[in-house]
């Protein structure tokens, strides 16, 4: 009955500070409303990066000021986090909640280690 969530172990952010990964869940119920949350774990502290609730078959809608965007297809969510800097390197955990109809189910992935490398500044040209 427990819900399993799968996500890649490692992702390297692009030079523009964008990282994308797939979060897939094995739904034990027939949910119509799903909440997806990205958590960041650093030094045993867990913080929320972004969250979106969507109706199955519809697109994810994150808040306008969110650093996350995403699309959904069946039990799979494609997540993109932008604006990342080297200091944002860390473990990003995908949390999925089947909100409606009851019963509620929780699924938490093992996390994706996102590595972010700040680009070297361009050398001054004379």
């Amino acid at each position: 009955k427990a819900m399993h969530v799968a996500q890649p172990a490692v992702v390297l952010a692009s030079s523009r500070g964008i990282a994308s990964f797939v979060c897939e869940y094995a739904s034990p119920g027939k949910a119509t409303e799903v909440r997806v949350t990205v958590l960041r774990q650093a030094d045993s502290q867990v913080t929320e990066v972004c969250a979106a609730t969507y109706m199955m078959g519809n697109e994810l809608t994150f808040l306008d000021d969110s650093i996350c965007t995403g699309t959904s297809s069946g039990n799979q969510v494609n997540l993109t986090i932008q604006g990342l800097r080297a200091m944002d390197t860390g473990l990003y955990i995908c949390k999925v909640e089947l909100m409606y109809p009851p019963p509620y189910y929780l699924g938490i992935g093992n996390g994706t280690q996102i590595y972010v490398i700040d680009p070297e500044p361009c050398p001054d040209s004379d």
Partner: antibody, heavy 118, light 107 residues
Framework: EVQLVESGGGLVKPGGSLRLSCAAS????????MNWVRQAPGKGLEWVSS????????YYAESVKGRFTISRDNAKNSLYLQMNSLRAEDTAVYYC???????????WGQGTMVTVSS | EIVLTQSPGTLSLSPGERATLSCRAS??????LGWYQQKPGQAPRLLIY???TRATGIPDRFSGSGSGTDFTLTITRLEPEDFAVYYC?????????FGQGTKVEIK
């Protein structure tokens, strides 16, 4: 300091009503799901009801469904439990509890006692 | 509903001894299991979540293990303040359920 403080408990007759409140402080209340959990005298813990951060999703234990109503006011950092048609078996200490980001109930209030007796 | 069964009901031990508490689920809860400590007249306090991760501020003498249906809470060296009732809880699906508790008392 992260804190939850319950109030509103007391003695009520069978069939009566009571409204419990839980005041939250020290964290962004509007970002967390909240719960009510009760504990009858000398007994274990029993989950009663849950409400999502924006009140969109609400869940009840079968034992209270149709009699209890959970609600919240994010502007007031407060959680409520309206209890109607109270029975002797509802006698318990009622705790409000926050749902942590990873799922467990990570912060609990000190509890408020509800006694249903004629 | 997922039923959690804790054993033993009571554990009589002396300070400094090791305590091993068991929690068995009626069906798999994966690792969505927490342990709570409750002292008389106080609210429960989260000790362990995710079956094995210590909550903030919890001493390392407390450890959790297990997955699926069988879980264990171990207290390596009992301190006087550890004598209390311990509850397991599954939070992977509603209704959220608790075990009936294990009382750890001074022998």
């Amino acid at each position: 300091e992260v804190q939850l403080v319950e109030s509103g408990g007391g003695l009520v007759k069978p069939g009566g009503s009571l409204r419990l409140s839980c005041a939250a402080s020290g964290f962004t209340f509007s970002s967390y799901s909240m719960n009510w959990v009760r504990q009858a005298p000398g007994k274990g813990l029993e989950w009663v009801s849950s409400i999502s951060s924006s009140s969109s999703y609400i869940y009840y234990a079968e034992s209270v469904k149709g009699r209890f109503t959970i609600s919240r006011d994010n502007a007031k950092n407060s959680l409520y439990l309206q209890m109607n048609s109270l029975r002797a078996e509802d006698t318990a200490v009622y705790y409000c509890a926050r749902v942590g980001l990873m799922g467990p109930f990570d912060i609990w209030g000190q509890g408020t006692m509800v006694t249903v007796s004629s | 509903e997922i039923v959690l069964t804790q054993s033993p009901g009571t554990l009589s031990l002396s300070p400094g001894e090791r305590a091993t508490l068991s929690c068995r689920a009626s069906q798999s809860v994966s690792r969505y299991l927490g342990w709570y400590q409750q002292k008389p007249g106080q609210a429960p306090r989260l000790l362990i979540y995710g079956a094995s991760t210590r909550a903030t501020g919890i001493p390392d003498r407390f450890s959790g293990s297990g997955s699926g249906t069988d879980f264990t809470l171990t207290i390596t060296r009992l301190e006087p303040e550890d004598f209390a009732v311990y509850y397991c809880q599954q939070y992977g699906s509603s209704p959220w359920t608790f075990g009936q508790g294990t009382k750890v008392e001074i022998k």
